[in-house]
């Protein structure tokens, strides 16, 4: 029961995380114009991974895509790559984890196979979350570096006569969305890995012990559940002794988590 809950919760948390990573990647507000002490500005600049936008006090907003690929900074390309890798891994992880969910029955899929898939999706979620966190952090670092550089050169001009105010950029909403989403995906992945450990029952191979009675030679094999210690075990989970306990498979199934997506 706890394993199913952990797995289901891990799936939902990862799903929210990956949706957040996708949202952050698509958002235009990765960097926003620093407004200093002035909350109202006539021209407000903000930039995303794919385009830069300008919002005027008239309400008019104009966005322009970065139509060049080679002309873009290497750091921006790296951030794009990290976010895309994060999304792809997360999407594959979601697909795998759907089939791994205990509350979803697919033919006669064994617990060990589900455990394998749960671990695989968990690892994918962890890597996906790390990619997103890394991508957002690289971009944030780039912003901090540029912020202090532009602060140092805040006013440039010819002989101090003409001032050119350099636009400084600070953290945009997408960065916070990305950090939170990456964290959620990471947590979801860890939960999936934890759930995986409890999915396949522990395989304790007891050696058959022979007890020699005075008369007859009777071999007595102590019963119990075969449990897998590893994730690669493909042995059938045969029950030799049933003392009235129910296996995980016999617990009532709950509405599948993906019904609510």
């Amino acid at each position: 029961m706890a394993v199913t809950a952990c797995q289901g919760l891990g799936f939902v948390v990862s799903l929210i995380g990956i949706a957040g990573i996708i949202a952050a990647t698509c958002m235009d507000q990765w960097s926003t114009q620093d407004l200093y002490n002035n909350p109202v500005t006539a021209v407000f600049n903000y930039q995303g991974l794919w385009r830069s936008c300008v919002r005027e006090s008239s309400g008019f907003t104009e966005c322009r895509g970065y139509f060049t690929l080679l002309g873009l900074p290497a750091m921006l390309q790296a951030v794009r790559a990290l976010m895309i890798v994060g999304i792809v891994l997360g999407a594959i992880g979601l697909l795998v984890s759907i089939f791994a969910l205990k509350c979803i029955r697919i033919g006669s899929m064994e617990d060990s196979a589900k455990a394998n898939m749960t671990l695989t999706s968990g690892i994918m979620f962890i890597v996906s979350g790390l990619c997103a966190i890394a991508g957002v952090s690289v971009f944030a670092n780039m912003l901090v570096t540029n912020f202090w550089m532009s602060t140092a050169n805040m006013y440039t001009g010819m002989g101090g006569m003409v001032q050119t105010v350099q636009t400084r950029y600070t953290f945009g909403a997408a960065l916070f969305v990305g950090w939170v989403a990456g964290g959620l995906t990471l947590i979801g992945g860890v939960m999936m890995c934890i759930a995986c450990r409890g999915l396949a029952p522990e395989e304790t191979n007891y050696k058959a012990v022979s007890y020699h009675a005075s008369g007859h030679s009777v071999a007595y094999k102590p019963g119990g559940f075969k449990a897998s210690t590893g994730f690669g075990s493909n042995t059938k989970n045969k029950k030799i002794y049933d003392g009235g306990a129910r296996t995980e498979d016999e617990v009532q199934s709950y509405p599948s988590k993906h019904d609510y997506v």
């Epitope: 006539a42 830069s52 005027e56 008239s58 309400g59 008019f60 104009e62």
Partner: antibody, heavy 115, light 113 residues
Framework: EVQLVESGGGLVQPGGSLRLSCAVS?????MNWVRQAPGKGLEWVAW????????TYADDFKGRFTISRDDSKNTLYLQMNSLRAEDTAVYYC???????????WGQGTLVTVSS | DIQMTQSPSSLSASVGDRVTITCKSS????????????LTWYQQKPGKAPKLLIY???TLESGVPSRFSGSGSGTDYTLTISSLQPEDFATYYC?????????FGQGTKVEIK
């Protein structure tokens, strides 16, 4: 088609108050008040976001003038307090257009501050 | 605040003349985000409200005759009337549309010679 009609101008004594209105028809995201003293140039007074009500003012008018709007009446206001003789001018309301220019203007309302 | 300085303050010209009015700002009006200069030009006739002619330094407002053109970037801008018409005799203002407070130039009065 946007139409702007100002009202509320008139004669007021120094230190007095006056509220100007601008009836707005048509789409406006943000609005401005601009004034022009007799024989002088244009002077921007204040701006307001018609959706959020967020205002900003020219330094000379902060604390004395208040720009506001009434959503239900689709009207823009300029509350002017502590009026001085130098506030005598024609006051225009104007809509902000792309490029932050003012594309639609009212006909103007004259405010005279005199004792 | 950004100061706007127009020159000349007045000029006399004849119909058909090419007229140039310059406007200088104390700070650059060029926005790095979209590479547009936030300078606006207006025409005002006596007793009337100003009329928008040009925004983004060079974009002609709809309905404005093509004889009007704007140019410039950074801190130096120009309004040109290629062939002055009788209805063009008026006062012209430039405006900083880049940052609050919006500021206007003192105006250039175009009179008949």
């Amino acid at each position: 088609e946007v139409q702007l009609v100002e009202s509320g101008g008139g004669l007021v004594q120094p230190g007095g108050s006056l509220r100007l209105s601008c009836a707005v028809s048509g789409y406006t995201f943000s609005m401005n008040w601009v004034r022009q003293a007799p024989g002088k140039g244009l002077e921007w007074v204040a701006w307001i976001n018609m959706y959020t009500g967020e205002p900003t003012y020219a330094d000379d008018f902060k604390g004395r003038f208040t720009i506001s709007r009434d959503d239900s009446k689709n009207t823009l206001y300029l509350q002017m307090n502590s009026l001085r003789a130098e506030d005598t001018a024609v006051y225009y309301c104007a809509r902000t257009a792309p490029g932050n220019g003012f594309d639609y203007w009212g006909q103007g309302t004259l405010v005279t501050v005199s004792s | 605040d950004i100061q706007m300085t127009q020159s000349p303050s007045s000029l006399s010209a004849s119909v058909g003349d090419r007229v140039t009015i310059t406007c200088k700002s104390s700070q650059s009006l060029l926005n790095s985000g979209n590479q547009k200069s936030y300078l606006t030009w207006y025409q005002q006739k006596p007793g009337k409200a100003p009329k928008l002619l040009i925004y983004w330094a060079s974009t002609l407002e709809s309905g404005v005759p093509s004889r009007f053109s704007g140019s410039g970037s950074g801190t130096d801008y120009t309004l040109t009337i290629s062939s002055l018409q009788p209805e063009d005799f008026a006062t012209y203002y430039c405006q900083n549309a880049y940052s609050f407070p919006f500021t206007f130039g003192q105006g250039t009065k175009v009179e008949i010679k």
